[in-house]
């Protein structure tokens, strides 16, 4: 019978044993930075090469007894999860192991840095196909470890790491907090976050997705044919490293940004019970469980987008928060969110030649988040058009006036502490879809993009009486690029995209005593690329 | 050669006290620093430390990913190290764990 975890990552229409061919991932090399490993275990023999790299601290304690099978336990199991012949995800992937963790599973930031440098030098000396680096370890937040991961990622290497097993915000740990790294949390057979003793999987905005990480059957270092069940975010990360190897083997030219977008796109959505997470982390934590794509030849025709949350701005009056897209992603829209509702909106602005999303806190606010919608849009030329506050009763409007440019997102930002209630008489005049509309006291920012074959449409869902949540989703074949609220009044906490759905949150009506005048509309901008669709048809 | 005007190198350490490894530091140099400059900066630190009666040991010189070096030294020398040319920041070593 197939282990639950392999079943879970297999697309519904396939059997796991058919779907995971013995040569899956064969064009990819996976580096594992972990404990020593038993590379002649039947599950992994011939699949894993032990490099001569070793940089580990001495074991703690005077009476520590170094038992080989214990020393090898963690690394052997993970190598088996990635590429094991019976219980591995990418059975054809070849692996190289570096020892950076001692027999107690402990290493150092410096040893890990030297290991990453070793990989970079190996890559320069003997360039091979796509490289995946699996970092099934975590320490406290480290600027230098994150920087090294960033450099390696920019050299074309895909890094996958464990979110951490501390039942805490993954942003407090490294390399989990490095934006360039694919950070993986752990779920169980019931798609629930994994509990590990009194702790459990980390969570939060620094997690990219979750993957199976409880009771995972894999190679045991107790004997050359033994298996054992292990749990943790390391096991979850190993699944994603295996999935990445499969995807890169099918499409070796994929960039890190493309791979991350595909991992998110093909994940199972909204299956995790968010009640397990602390309340303030639920909105920030992706409800995604990794899965293999339904076919081995890519999905190049798709317009892929993901949501990136900023760090919390902090509560000071002028505090701002910035959300950034990856270097080869386009920022197509920007929104903001505040639990207290006290915010001054958001704007897209250029920073270092790239657009970023900046959200503004308001006086008395507990802080804001900026939420960027980051998309893969080849040959895109995007710009921001701004209209200052109109002060007129009609509200502020801005549209994309350049030929061939389409509206992908609307943002609004205001200097006043509290926007009065305001309901524009006409939300959007017919025949003007390329237009953003907002409060008369707000500046409105339109994200306007030109890209081959890009078409977008506006979809609205308004509710007459205020509700805590209003949503609107894009239909099949369309991708959500923009999500905003109309009007931008004070009882609106903010707007954000969850997968292909635009969510607008308002304050609890019972506590605010709002009137029915303050209707809330969720505005989604849905786009698709005819160019990408045609290109993929030509390839097939 | 003094550090560039107006840029102050910063010191970082792990927020989780039990995971700190004082006595070992990663000295990260500015992005375009060459290997020879890294080695020179490391030697300069050793020489200046020796003049103050401190022993230091260069454990590794980084190049390929980040320019810099790993040094075993007393925390008393941090102020001195932060003033070295080309230094961007210094981070105290810390533990990582299998997850």
């Amino acid at each position: 019978s197939i282990p639950w975890n392999l079943e879970r990552i297999t697309p519904p229409r396939y059997r796991a044993d058919e779907y995971q061919p013995p040569d899956g991932g064969s064009l990819v090399e996976v580096y594992l930075l972990d404990t020593s490993i038993q590379s002649d275990h039947r599950e992994i023999e011939g699949r894993v090469m032990v490099t001569d790299f070793e940089n580990v601290p001495e074991e703690d304690g005077t009476r520590f007894h170094r038992q080989a099978s214990k020393c090898d336990s963690h690394g052997t199991h993970l190598a088996g999860v990635v590429s094991g012949r019976d219980a591995g995800v990418a059975k054809g992937a070849s692996m190289r192991s570096l020892r950076v963790l001692n027999c107690q599973g402990k290493g150092t930031v410096s040893g890990t840095l030297i290991g990453l440098e070793f990989i970079r030098k190996s890559q320069l000396v003997q360039p091979v196909g796509p490289l995946v680096v699996l970092l099934p370890l975590a320490g406290g937040y480290s600027r230098v470890l994150n920087a090294a991961c960033q450099r390696l990622a920019r050299a074309g290497v895909v890094l996958v790491t464990a979110a951490g097993n501390f039942r805490d915000d993954a942003c407090l740990y490294s390399p989990a907090s490095a934006p360039e790294v694919i950070t993986v949390g752990a779920t169980n057979a019931q798609d629930q976050p994994v509990t590990l003793g009194t702790l459990g999987t980390n969570f939060g905005r620094c997690v990219d997705l979750f993957a199976p990480g409880e009771d995972i059957i894999g190679a045991s270092s107790d004997c050359s044919t033994c298996f054992v069940s292990q749990s943790g975010t390391s096991q979850a990360a190993a699944h994603v490293a295996g999935i990445a190897a499969m995807m890169l083997s099918a499409e070796p030219e994929l960039t890190l940004a493309e791979l991350r977008q595909r991992l998110i796109h093909f994940s199972a959505k909204d299956v995790i019970n968010e009640a397990w997470f602390p309340e303030d982390q639920r909105v920030l934590t992706p409800n995604l469980v990794a899965a293999l794509p339904p076919s081995t030849h890519g999905a190049g025709w798709q317009l892929f987008c993901r949501t990136v949350w900023s760090a919390h701005s902090g509560p000071t009056r002028m505090a701002t928060a910035i959300a950034r897209c990856a270097p080869d992603e386009e920022l197509l829209s920007c929104s903001s969110f505040s639990r207290s509702g006290k915010r001054r909106g958001e704007r897209m602005e250029a920073q270092g030649g790239k657009l970023v999303c900046r959200a503004h806190n308001a006086f008395g606010g507990e802080g804001v988040y900026a939420i960027a919608r980051c998309c893969l849009l080849p040959q895109a030329n995007c710009s921001v058009h701004t209209a200052p506050p109109a002060e007129a009763s009609m509200g502020t409007r801005v549209h994309c006036h350049q030929q061939g440019h389409v509206l992908t997102g609307c943002s609004s930002h205001w200097e006043v502490e509290d926007l009065g209630t305001h309901k524009p008489p006409v939300l959007r005049p017919r025949g003007q879809p390329n237009q953003c509309v907002g409060h008369r006291e707000a500046s409105i920012h339109a994200s306007c993009c030109h890209a081959p074959g890009l078409e977008c449409k506006v979809k609205e869902h308004g509710i007459p009486a205020p509700q805590e949540q209003v949503t609107v989703a894009c239909e099949e074949g369309w991708t959500l690029t923009g999500c905003s609220a109309l009007p931008g009044t004070s009882h609106v906490l903010g707007a954000y995209a969850v997968d292909n759905t635009c969510v607008v949150r308002s304050r609890d009506v019972s506590t605010t005593g709002s009137t029915s005048e303050e209707a809330v509309t969720a505005v989604a901008i849905c786009c698709r690329s005819r160019h990408l669709a045609q290109a993929s048809q030509e390839l097939q | 050669e003094a550090p560039e005007h107006g840029t102050t190198a910063t010191f970082h350490r792990c927020a989780k006290d039990p995971w700190r490894l004082p006595g070992t530091y990663v000295v990260v140099l500015k992005e375009e620093t060459h290997l020879s400059q890294s080695e020179r900066t490391a030697r300069r630190l050793q020489a200046q430390a020796a003049r103050r009666g401190y022993l230091t040991k260069i454990l590794h010189v980084f190049h390929g990913l980040l320019p810099g070096f790993l040094v075993k030294m007393s925390g008393d020398l941090l102020e001195l190290a932060l003033k070295l040319p080309h230094v961007d920041y210094i981070e105290e070593d810390s533990s990582v764990f299998a997850q």
Epitope: D40, R42, E45, G46 | -
Partner: antibody, heavy 115, light 107 residues
């Protein structure tokens, strides 16, 4: 290139012991164990067991019934298979092969048990 | 232990012929089946692993197929150097077990 070179032919009396060696080269020995397979005259192939260069762990076929011992000496990249209390039906060609996958084989060592 | 049964136990064929040898396992072995070629006085040589994968250096005229319990080795166009004994071996469980062999002789 991968090579497994075995020791020469042996003639033994019933009840005696034999120790066959297999020297590995051309690959990283710790990444693979060594399997031992025998073939009686005119017969098929029979797997006897496996031994690790990495930690000396073994995995024996039940049929050996404690008569066989497999060892390795990583310093010389050599694996050994010792068979005790030899019987006439142990007469066979003994092969070593790389790992459980048995993708490369030694040339074989003929062991003849005869009174 | 898993029993492996090969058929036929021997066959006569001419150069250029297409030859098929079958192997049946006593229980499902997924795709964990290897094929070996052995010439008189020589060690076996791995021809096919995991039912259908050819190691580098093995001519493309050799191909393997099947999964579960039934497997086939096909030689698309028999060459003079292909006259030998062929063994299947299951790699699913320990101990690995071999078929009794199929001897391919010149007609």
């Amino acid at each position: 290139q991968v090579q497994l070179v075995q020791s020469g032919a042996e003639v033994k009396k019933p009840g005696a012991s034999v120790k066959v060696s297999c020297k590995a080269s051309g690959y990283a020995i710790y990444n693979y164990g060594i399997s031992w397979v025998r073939q009686a005259p005119g017969q098929g192939l029979e797997w006897m067991g496996w031994v690790s260069f990495y930690n000396g762990n073994t995995n024996y076929a039940q049929k050996l019934q404690g008569r066989g011992t497999m060892t390795t000496d990583p310093s010389t990249s050599t694996a050994y298979m010792e068979l005790r209390s030899l019987r006439s039906d142990d007469t066979a060609v003994y092969y070593c092969a790389r790992g459980y996958v048995m993708d490369f084989w030694g040339q074989g060592t003929t062991v003849t048990v005869s009174s | 232990d898993i029993q492996m049964t090969q058929s036929p136990s021997s066959l006569s064929a001419s150069v250029g012929d297409r030859v098929t040898i079958t192997c049946r396992a006593s229980q499902s072995i997924n795709n964990w089946l290897d094929w070996y070629q052995q010439k008189p006085g020589k060690a076996p040589k791995l021809l096919i692993y995991a039912a259908s994968t050819r190691p580098s250096g093995v001519p493309s005229r050799f191909s393997g197929s099947g999964s579960g319990t039934d497997f086939t080795l096909t030689i698309s166009s028999l060459q003079p150097e292909d006259f030998a004994t062929y063994y299947c071996q299951q790699d699913q469980d320990i101990p690995p077990t071999f078929g009794q062999g199929t001897k391919v002789e010149i007609k």
